[in-house]
Structure formats: C-alpha cells, structure tokens
C-alpha cells in the first residue's frame, strides 16, 4: 500500500529582504511524488526552485525537498503543493522562523 508523506515547511533568512522557504516531504511510499512551490496558485518555473533527490530514509520510505527564495513580506502568496498517490495538499509558509508546519496526509 501507500504511505502518505509528512510535509514540513520552514523558512530561513537568505539575504536582506529575502527568505529561503523549504518544503520537505518525508516518510512516504511509493517514491513518486510531486512537490513544488506555487505563487498565487501557479507553480513557479523550474529555474526558480531547487529540488533535492528522492532518497530512501532507511525505513522503507522516502524523503525529498524543494526550496525557493522569496521576498520577505510576500509569504502569503506562496504555498508548497504536494501530490502523492492521488492525494494532494497545499502548505503555507509559516509566519515566523520558529514556526514549522507538520502535516500528515491520508
């Protein structure tokens, strides 16, 4: 059967006026997954995102990530979109550095 991913969105300071937002999906099976950043609901182009490889995490499941750099103050426009085994979800950027969003999807 399939195991839905845990999705975790974090943010970190990149440079003055910019932040890097990273969306991590972990503990999912099978390995096929769509993970992409969207702005106003529209997927960012590939050249503005960085993807990690889909790697085994040692538990028979997989993990991956996608990151992009955005302007501070525009966080509300961005969501991480995840699609896995016919299920999908969108995940907002947390409002502060200490905030992480963890969601398990079934």
């Amino acid at each position: 059967g399939s195991v839905p991913p845990m999705v975790n969105v974090t943010r970190s300071e990149a440079s003055e006026g910019n932040i890097t937002v990273t969306c991590r999906a972990s503990s999912f099976y099978p390995r096929n997954i769509t993970l992409t950043w969207r702005q106003d609901g529209v997927s960012l182009s590939h050249d503005t995102q960085q993807w990690g490889d889909v790697l085994p995490d040692g538990n028979g499941t997989y993990q991956t990530w996608v990151a992009t750099r955005i302007c501070q103050g525009e966080e509300q426009r961005f969501t991480c979109y995840m699609e896995h085994s016919g299920n999908h979800s969108t995940h907002p950027v947390p409002s502060g550095n200490s905030h992480h969003h963890h969601h398990h999807h079934h």
């Epitope: 106003d40 609901g41 529209v42 997927s43 182009s45 503005t48 969501t79 999908h88 979800s89 969108t90």
Partner: antibody
Framework: EVQLVQSGAEVKKPGASVKVSCKAS????????IYWVRQAPGQGLEWIGY????????IYNQQFKDRVTITADTSTSTAYLELSSLRSEDTAVYYC???????????WGQGTLVTVSS | EIVLTQSPATLSLSPGERATLSCSAS???????LHWYQQKPGQAPRLLIY???NLASGIPARFSGSGSGTDFTLTISSLEPEDFAVYYC?????????FGQGTKVEIK
C-alpha cells in the same frame, strides 16, 4: 473536462448585496486556486481576489477588500463571491477562473452579469 | 501596482496580415509572469500564451510571444477570420494581479 459553471444574472438596487457562485468540476477542487475577475461593460479585466480552497487562504485586491467576501465550500466544489454596498459602477460581468499550472487563469466560468440600477 | 499599457488600442488589419501587439509594464516583470488572453464578444477570456512565449493548449502556431523586462509582444503571423478579437496581457509577478486595457484587432 474542467468546467466552471456560474450562477445566473442578477439585478440589484444600489446599497444591496449580491452573491455569485462558481461550481467547479472535472478536477480536484482543492488542488487549484479560484480567482474572481470582473469586467464592466466595454471595459477591461479587473482582478478582485482569490481563494485557496484547500487551506482557506484568501487574497484580496485592496481596492475591493472592504466590500468583497470570497468563500468556498469544498463539499460541493463551489466558490462564492459576495459584493456588498453595491453601486452603479459595480455593474459588470463577474468571472471565476482557475489558477493554472503555468498561468494565473487557465479555465474560466461563463460569467455572471450583475446589474446595479435603481 | 504594476500598470500594463497595451498599444495600439485598436489594430485594423485584413485577414492574412501580420499583427503585432505591444504590452509595456510600469516596472520590470520576470518573463515567467507575463501572459496573454484572447476575448471574443460575449465570451470569457481564453488563455493564449503563458510565461511570455509558451502556447497554451490548442492554440495555433501562428500566435507567438516574446519580450523581457518591461516590453512584451504578441504576434499573429497571418490573421485568420477567427483571430479578430480583443487581446489582454496580464502580469502575475506582484499583487495586485493586473491586466492591460486590451488591444482590439478588427477587420479593416
């Protein structure tokens, strides 16, 4: 086939409110944003706002923020636009549209004409 | 707010002629965020070109787009009767999302 079907034309008096619906089909409703755009007679297109039905996030054009409410009912795959304190200059065709993979508006509803007249 | 100015307001041409429509932005826009739509009377707009130069599904190859920064162009290489319509550019780079005022391509 992706379809966005809007409610019928409305005639309202100044000061009243109107609620326009947009029923989506042919795709997973919560996977795309729904935008609202209006077009006054003989004029151009004006973006009102959008909703992400999955997380319920709404972004408004500041120009409309005080009088507009955008909502969505995921159980019926329907988005709504409510405009209050109507005035004659709100007479327009109101469109709903879906956020595309690569563009902001890839599928459109047929439009709903709202006429504000005393 | 990014203001998009389209020119000319009206373009009078004959079938078979080449149409060149311009869209000028008040601030620089990434080419990823500039799109074109076609609208015929009594109909909703239809996505024509996305991200400056990519044809939307089902759009014939006589349509093309180009540009960068603040200046973008939609070209129709040889006008067909069904191409006479109003064309709008739109930017998705910054809020509020904005459209140009439109260029009407009419039969001469």
């Amino acid at each position: 086939e992706v379809q966005l079907v809007q409610s019928g034309a409305e005639v309202k008096k100044p000061g009243a409110s109107v609620k326009v619906s947009c029923k989506a089909s042919g795709y997973a409703f919560t996977s795309n944003n729904i935008y609202w755009v209006r077009q006054a007679p003989g004029q151009g297109l004006e973006w009102i706002g959008y909703i992400d039905p999955y997380i319920g996030r709404i972004i408004y054009n500041q120009q409309f923020k005080d009088r507009v409410t955008i909502t969505a009912d995921t159980s019926t795959s329907t988005a709504y636009l409510e405009l209050s304190s109507l005035r004659s200059e709100d007479t327009a065709v109101y469109y709903c549209s879906r956020s595309g993979e690569r563009s902001n508006f890839d599928y459109w509803g047929q439009g709903t004409l709202v006429t504000v007249s005393s | 707010e990014i203001v998009l100015t389209q020119s000319p307001a009206t373009l009078s041409l004959s079938p078979g002629e080449r149409a060149t429509l311009s869209c000028s932005a008040s601030s620089s826009i990434s080419s990823n965020y500039l799109h074109w739509y076609q609208q015929k009377p009594g109909q909703a707009p239809r996505l024509l070109i996305y991200r400056t130069s990519n044809l939307a599904s089902g759009i014939p190859a006589r349509f093309s787009g180009s540009g960068s920064g603040t200046d973008f162009t939609l070209t129709i290489s040889s006008l067909e009767p069904e191409d006479f319509a109003v064309y709008y550019c739109q930017q998705g780079g910054s809020l509020p999302l904005t459209f140009g005022q439109g260029t009407k391509v009419e039969i001469k």
